[in-house]
C-alpha cells in the first residue's frame, strides 16, 4: 500500500530565539512512500503494524512502542510439584512374570494394594498426591515408583516441598522397618524388606519469578524487580506506584530510560521544578527555593 505524507512549512523557536523554517514542499505533488508492513518503521522496539496500530512487544507500549511499561505480567504456576523416585522391596507377594505386564489382572491388583498401602503411609502429608509404579521386578517384588507431591505456589514453595520430601523419606523408612515378615508371613497389608528402600532421585518444579521478570524486561532487566503482595509476585519498575521500590517523583512524571528510572519535572504557572526527584521548586517571580 501507498501512504501520502502531508508536508507543510513549520516555524519553531529555538532556545536562542532564532527562527528555523522547514523546507517547503509543493503540496500539489503529494509525497508517497512504500510501506513494508510496519508503517515505515513507525513501530519501534520490535513492534509491528497490524494495519490499524502498533502491536508492541513486552516491555513497550504507546503509539509507536516508544514507552516502557511500569509493570510486566508474570504468571507463576498455581501449583508446584515434586517427584520422588523411590524403590521398595515388597516381601509379602511372590514375583510372577505377569506383574511386568501393566494391563494384567496381577499388575492391576498389585497396583491397587500398593497404592492403598502408600496412601496410608503418607496420609499425614498435605502435599502428597499419590504414587505411580514405574516398574516391578524380581526380588521378591522390587517396586520402582514415583511419589508425587504438590502444593500451592508461594514464595516459600521450595522449602515446603523440601520439607515434604524429608517427611516422605522418614515415613517410608519407618513403614519398611516395621512392616516385615514374621515366620514367613505378613500380618500387615504389605510387608517389606528393610534394606530394599532407596530414594533414587528428587525433581522439584523450578520457577523463579525474578528470572521471568528479568527475561521479560529485556534490556531493562537491571531496573525491573520483583515485589510480593499477598504472596503474589509483581514484576515492576520504580515507576510503578504503591510498592517499596516505587520512585517518588513529587512534582514530576516517572519515566523509564535505558539508564533506569528518572523523573521528568513539570513546570506550573507559578513554579519550575527540578532535582532528581522533582522536589526542588523555584518560584517563577521570585528566585528562591522551596524544599
Amino acid at each position: 500500500p501507498l501512504a501520502t505524507i502531508p508536508v507543510s512549512t513549520t516555524s519553531l523557536t529555538s532556545s536562542e530565539g532564532s527562527t528555523i523554517s522547514t523546507p517547503s514542499v509543493d503540496i500539489s505533488t503529494p509525497v508517497t512512500t512504500s510501506i513494508v508492513g510496519d508503517q515505515c518503521s513507525r513501530c519501534k522496539n520490535g513492534g509491528f503494524w497490524d494495519g490499524l496500530k502498533c502491536q508492541c512487544l513486552t516491555p513497550y507500549y504507546g503509539e509507536s512502542c516508544e514507552e516502557v511499561v511500569n509493570s510486566i505480567d508474570i504468571a507463576p504456576p498455581e501449583t508446584v510439584s515434586a517427584q520422588m523416585e523411590l524403590t521398595v522391596t515388597v516381601t509379602s507377594v511372590k514375583f510372577t512374570d505377569e506383574l511386568k505386564n501393566h494391563s494384567s489382572q496381577e499388575f492391576r491388583e498389585f497396583n491397587k494394594t500398593f497404592t492403598e498401602q502408600m496412601n496410608i503411609v503418607y496420609s499425614g502429608i498435605p502435599e502428597y498426591v499419590g504414587v505411580n509404579i514405574t516398574n516391578l521386578r524380581l526380588g521378591s517384588v522390587v517396586v520402582e515408583h514415583d511419589v508425587l507431591l504438590r502444593t500451592k505456589y508461594t514464595p516459600e514453595y521450595k522449602t515446603a516441598l523440601d520439607n515434604a520430601t524429608e517427611v516422605v523419606k522418614q515415613k517410608i523408612t519407618k513403614v519398611t522397618t516395621e512392616q516385615i515378615m514374621t515366620n514367613d508371613n505378613c500380618s500387615a497389608l504389605m510387608c517389606f524388606n528393610t534394606t530394599g528402600t532407596q530414594v533414587q532421585n528428587i525433581t522439584v518444579t523450578q520457577y523463579d519469578p525474578v528470572e521471568e521478570c528479568r527475561q521479560k524486561a529485556e534490556e531493562y532487566e537491571d531496573y525491573f524487580l520483583v515485589e510480593y503482595r499477598d504472596q503474589k509476585p509483581y514484576c515492576i519498575s520504580p515507576c510503578e506506584s504503591g510498592f517499596n521500590a516505587s520512585k517518588n517523583c513529587n512534582h514530576g512524571k516517572c519515566q523509564m530510560s535505558q539508564n533506569g528510572a528518572r523523573c521528568l519535572c513539570v513546570t506550573t504557572e507559578t513554579h519550575w521544578y527540578s532535582g532528581e526527584d522533582c522536589n526542588q521548586g523555584t518560584q517563577k517571580s521570585h528566585h528562591h527555593h522551596h524544599h
Partner: nanobody
C-alpha cells in the same frame, strides 16, 4: 472380575467333620492365591488357611493345624477346606477369599475378592 461362591456349611457336633467348597471364576491365570477366613460373632475376621494354586505354598493358623486341610482342584477351579475334630470355638461364618497375586499375608485387607460366607455351627 473374580467371583467366589461357598458351600458346605452347616451344624455339626463337636468332634465331627465338614467339608467346605468355594468355586472360583473370572481368573485369567491358573496361578493365584486362595484362602479361608472365619469370623465368630463379636470377633475380628481371622485367617484359617491359605494356598497357592501352583502348589508352592500352604499356610495354617496355629489353632487349626493338624485338624483342617486346605486343597485346590485346578481342573474345577475349586477350593476346599476339610475340617475334622471340630470344636465349639470353630463356630463362625467361613469366608473364601482370593487374590490374583501369590500372597503371603494373613491380613484380610490384602485379599481383594470375597465370597458371601457360609455358617459353620459346632454344637451338641
Amino acid at each position: 472380575d473374580v467371583q467366589l461362591v461357598e458351600s458346605g456349611g452347616g451344624v455339626v457336633q463337636p468332634g465331627g467333620s465338614l467339608r467346605l467348597s468355594c468355586a472360583a471364576s473370572g481368573y485369567t491365570s491358573n496361578r493365584y492365591s486362595m484362602a479361608w477366613f472365619r469370623q465368630a460373632p463379636g470377633k475380628e475376621r481371622e485367617v484359617v488357611a491359605f494356598i497357592w494354586t501352583d502348589g508352592g505354598r500352604t499356610y495354617y493358623a496355629d489353632s487349626v493345624k493338624g485338624r483342617f486341610t486346605i486343597s485346590h482342584d485346578n481342573a474345577k477351579n475349586t477350593l476346599y477346606l476339610q475340617m475334622n475334630s471340630l470344636r465349639a470355638e470353630d463356630t463362625a461364618v467361613y469366608y473364601c477369599a482370593a487374590s490374583s497375586l501369590l500372597l503371603q499375608t494373613i491380613n484380610p485387607r490384602a485379599w481383594p475378592y470375597w465370597g458371601q460366607g457360609t455358617m459353620v455351627t459346632v454344637s451338641s
